[in-house]
């Protein structure tokens, strides 16, 4: 029969830190040198022995005069309440295969860490606990007099707990949040009645959680060292160091080395010469709470970062072409290095790729002269490629060419006597054209009568215009424009002697809030083209004079321009140009973009006043300049009388009124006479232009009586 | 009863240190925090640092941060805060004060004052 | 410049109830609980509201204390002559990592 093998000499000791028991025993009567498998099993009890809150088993191989040990976390800080512990075994081993009994109980041992000493009245525990954001935690308060009521707070807050015994509550606050670093405070007032007895207070330390780190990458850009970054997260650093910022370690399994990184978002990792070419690396995160790792495998030679070129240059610039010269950090041999241009200039971007060993170049071709380009250059490895390097750029400027394109020019004639005043228009070369920067512009007139002679005027830039006094003869002008480098082509019109066709009628057009369309009847025989020029009507025609080229088969063009103004009349011409480059005038034609209604109303006079009428004038009243084409006039006439007079129709005025409205469909019929009147009666006048916008501004009625019968005026 | 007493009056010229004590009665010293506010003349309360007595632990406001010491020594249960490169805008009366919880840490949690000492005053002028 | 706004004067009559305010931020009253201390010429400031709305021992029931979102007030009813002080809140700082102080409220009982 075999003795059972009670545990003895058990021992309990704890850590308040962690909240923990630590227990250790001996087994008796083991034999000597003998290796046996057993069970024990442990209760814990909480205040009393009878409340037993956590039984459970502990299986282990124990030796001949083997300390066993054993650990158990309390959720309830031990400060809080007296715990007991007892321990039974039982063999559970197939050297004894005959039926096993559990040994006695062990006795209970008692175990209580106090905390609640001196003369206070109220103890708050557990002291200083650092805990992880959504965990669950206990807290207690002992309270020696149990007359006292005690309310606790955190962060301000009542909370509710359940009572353990008389002097001790417990409070279970579940999934607590991060709310500072600096900690989370919790505090017990005991009272009696409405006096404060004392109050005691605990700071809870959350810390938020740990978060694997993200985005771990390991490059090279020399094969000597490898830099590794990652994104950490948040910081679970709290306040006064209870606990610092997560760490991070470097681990690579094949070489078995480990570094700690100094840095919390990336480390560097020296590359051993011995050819190691595959690397496997876990990134640890640690707090005092948790854990966290993540890890990546990879070919050293496929992880090439390379540092960006060097040395960026330009040889060889024309207006044209320039090539790009630059350098790469060598770091292997044989290395082979793909390479990317970027160039910028005009608002384009052309990219290319090219190969290259050690040194790169590339021939920019097709380049806009004058032209300031930037250039930049990033290169990868070609073999493996993984990620660009950063660019490495310069700026440069191509070299001017003569102007390609010659000035669009036009004219305006006037006849005076016995000569004709040419006022000569150029427009600017777009930057396209001009290759550089147009210095002057030479104007070559030639007297096509006499073809010996011609006069140069050289302008310089950037007049736009020039001014030539001619004779009644025919002349050629050729206006050319000109850079460092060279001249454009010659802009050539020709000035006939006779005079432009003066029997042109002027038609009106109607303009659109999209400018104005425009067409006209294709001139008999050849044409090389149109033009129609236009100019405000009334202003001086320097002041914003206009031309537009349009092609020999074409006989209509929209101008629309964001210069046309609503309620401003434009005045456009129409010119076939001929083989031989003289304008004919074929079509005049003005318009408003858009109508507006008059601006003013005519001053009226009132003449030849007798018993029975009297005339209304208005001579003065210009139809030009007015923002709409006048299409006649309304005269407003009020009388005592119920019926209008012959020819006035009955109208209501915007203030609501009633009137008498007669309607004048000429604009430059600017007289009325009212008759059929009553002598010594009050009648009164209003008269107003419109256009197809509508009436001029309304104003006040001008009063008239007529006289009796007897008067003379 | 319970009290916080304060040294005495104190003129220091510009650029000297001054040292303040606060003798605690009444209640354990080491279970509850002590504060440092002081008071120019005419002006509000503006709070310098406090000190844990049973760690000794301390915490200064970002203004008086490498000028301010406080420190304690529990056999006597005295408090003590000195300042260093007094200047004239220093004149003041400074006060320690209690927190109204003992709180069972070896750091800091504001929740009120509740017991104040009769306040030192420190003079700084030339 | 004080972290936490008060006015600077208040004034009641006898019986009148009187509240006195305290603005702040989602930094300092926002977060934290408040206090309210006031303090008669010449002597040491005293606690009257901990917690919000809590008195210490001693301190009549006609103080009373609140707070709404990130600002806190101080109301006293029945107002009496022995009232009038300077009143100042109080609160922890989390930007600051401080206790601040208000401007101070000089309470007139006319």
């Known amino acids: 029969e075999r003795l059972p093998l009670t545990p003895v000499s058990l021992k309990v000791s704890t850590n308040s830190t962690r909240q923990s028991l630590h227990l250790q025993w001996t087994v008796h009567n083991l034999p000597y040198h003998q290796e046996l498998k057993m069970v024990f099993q442990i209760q814990i009890s909480r205040i009393e022995t009878s409340n037993v809150i956590w039984v459970g088993n502990y299986s282990t191989t124990v030796k001949w005069n083997q300390v066993l040990h054993w650990s158990w976390e309390s959720e309830l800080p031990l400060e809080c309440a007296t715990h007991f512990v007892r321990i039974k075994s039982l063999v559970d081993d197939a050297k004894f295969p005959e039926p096993n009994f559990w040994s006695n109980w062990s006795s209970w041992e008692e175990v209580s860490v106090q905390d609640s000493t001196g003369q206070d009245i109220l103890f708050v525990f557990p002291k200083d606990k650092l805990v992880e954001e959504g965990t669950n935690v206990t807290i207690c308060y002992v309270s020696r007099n149990i007359q006292n009521n005690v309310s606790c707070y955190l962060e301000g807050k009542q909370i509710h707990g359940e009572q353990l015994d008389p002097h001790v509550t417990a409070f279970n606050l579940n999934s607590v949040p991060f709310i500072r670093n600096k900690g989370t405070n919790i505090y017990c007032e005991a009272s009696q009645g409405n006096v404060s007895e004392g109050m005691k207070g605990i700071v809870l330390f959350v810390s938020k959680v740990l978060e694997e780190p993200k985005d771990f990458s390991c490059e090279t850009e020399d094969f000597k060292t490898l830099h590794c970054t990652w994104d950490p997260g948040t910081d679970t650093a709290l306040g006064w160091s209870k606990q610092p910022s997560q760490s991070y370690t470097l681990f690579e399994s094949f070489s078995g080395e480990k570094k700690l990184c100094t840095h919390k978002n990336w480390c560097n990792w020296q590359i051993t010469q011995d050819s190691q070419e595959t690397y496997n690396f876990t990134l640890i995160a640690e707090n005092y709470l948790r854990k966290r790792s993540v890890n990546i495998l990879f070919n050293l030679t496929h992880r090439v970062y390379l540092m960006n070129p060097f040395s960026v240059n330009f040889e060889n610039v024309n207006a044209t072409n320039a090539i790009m010269t630059w350098k790469v950090h060598s770091i292997r041999n044989n290395f082979t290095y793909l390479c990317q241009i970027e160039l910028h200039g005009e608002g384009k971007m052309m990219q290319y790729n090219v190969s290259i060993k050690v040194n790169g170049e590339y021939f920019l071709s097709e380049l806009e002269p004058a032209t300031e380009y930037m250039a930049r250059v990033r290169c990868a490895d070609a073999s493996h490629f993984w990620k660009w390097s950063e660019w490495s750029g310069q700026n440069f400027t191509t070299l001017e060419a003569a102007p390609s394109e010659a000035p669009d020019v036009w004219r305006i004639v006037s006849l005076e006597p016995g000569n004709h005043t040419v006022t000569l228009f150029w427009k600017p070369l777009s930057k396209l054209h001009a290759n550089g920067k147009i210095l002057f512009y030479n104007v070559v007139v030639e007297n096509l009568d006499k073809p010996s002679s011609s006069e140069l005027h050289s302008i310089p830039a950037p007049a736009n215009s020039t001014k030539l006094i001619l004779d009644r003869c025919s002349y050629q002008i050729c206006v050319i424009a000109n850079n460092s480098v060279g001249a454009s082509p010659a802009s050539v019109i020709v000035i006939s002697a006779d005079p432009e066709n003066k029997e042109v009628e002027e038609e009106r057009i109607a303009g659109t809030e999209g400018g104005f369309s425009l067409s006209w009847k294709p001139q008999p025989g050849d044409v090389i083209g149109y033009v129609v020029d236009w100019c405000d009507h009334t202003q001086d025609v320097l002041g914003d004079f206009q031309w537009k080229n349009v092609g020999p088969n074409t006989t209509s063009t929209v101008i629309s321009t964001d210069a046309f103004r609503p309620g401003v009349r434009y005045d456009f011409r129409i010119y076939g140009l001929s083989t031989k480059r003289i304008a004919c005038l074929l079509e005049k034609k003005t318009g408003y973009s858009q109508e507006l209604a008059p601006s003013d109303n005519p001053h009226v006079l009132v003449d030849t006043l007798t018993s029975h009428s009297f005339t209304l004038s208005w001579k003065d009243y210009s139809t030009e300049s007015q923002p709409g084409f006048i299409q006649g006039y309304h005269v407003y006439l009020k009388s005592k009388a119920r019926q209008c007079h012959p020819r006035f129709e009955k109208a209501v005025l915007s203030d609501g009124s009633e009137c008498c409205k007669y309607k004048i469909d000429n604009p430059e019929e600017k007289a009325l006479i009212v008759d059929n009147l009553k002598p010594e009666s009050f009648y009164e006048f209003f008269i107003t232009p419109f256009t197809s916008a509508g009436e001029g501004p309304s104003a006040t009625f001008t009063k008239v009586t007529t006289p009796d019968e007897h008067s003379s005026m | 009863q319970v009290q916080l007493v304060q040294s005495g009056a104190e003129v220091k010229k510009p650029g000297a240190s001054v040292k303040v004590s606060c003798k605690a009665s009444g209640y354990t010293f080491t279970s509850y925090e002590i504060n440092w506010v002081r008071q120019a003349t005419g002006q509000g309360l503006e709070w310098m640092g406090w000190m844990n007595p049973n760690s000794g632990y301390t915490g200064y406001a970002q203004k008086f941060q490498g000028r301010v010491t406080m420190t304690r020594d529990t056999s006597i249960s005295t408090a003590y805060m000195e300042m260093s490169s007094l200047r004239s805008e220093d004149t003041a009366v400074y006060y320690c004060?209690?927190?109204?919880?003992?709180?069972?840490?070896?750091?800091?949690?504001?929740?009120?004052?509740?017991?104040w000492g009769q306040g030192t005053t420190v003079t700084v002028s030339s | 410049q004080s972290v936490l706004t008060q006015p600077p004067s208040a004034s009641g009559t006898p019986g009148q109830r009187v509240t006195i305010s305290c603005s702040g931020s989602n930094s300092n009253i926002g977060s934290n609980t408040v206090n309210w201390y006031h303090q008669l010429p010449g002597t040491a400031p005293k606690l009257l509201i901990y917690n919000i709305n809590k008195r210490p021992s001693g301190v009549p029931d006609r103080f009373s204390g609140s707070k709404s979102g990130s600002s806190a007030s101080l109301a006293i009813s029945g107002l009496q002559s022995e009232d009038e002080a300077d009143y100042y809140c109080s609160t922890w700082d989390d930007s600051l990592d401080g206790v601040v102080f208000g401007g101070g409220t000089k309470l007139t009982v006319l």
């Open positions: 004060a209690r927190d109204i919880v003992a709180a069972n840490t070896d750091y800091y949690f504001y929740y009120g004052m509740d017991v």
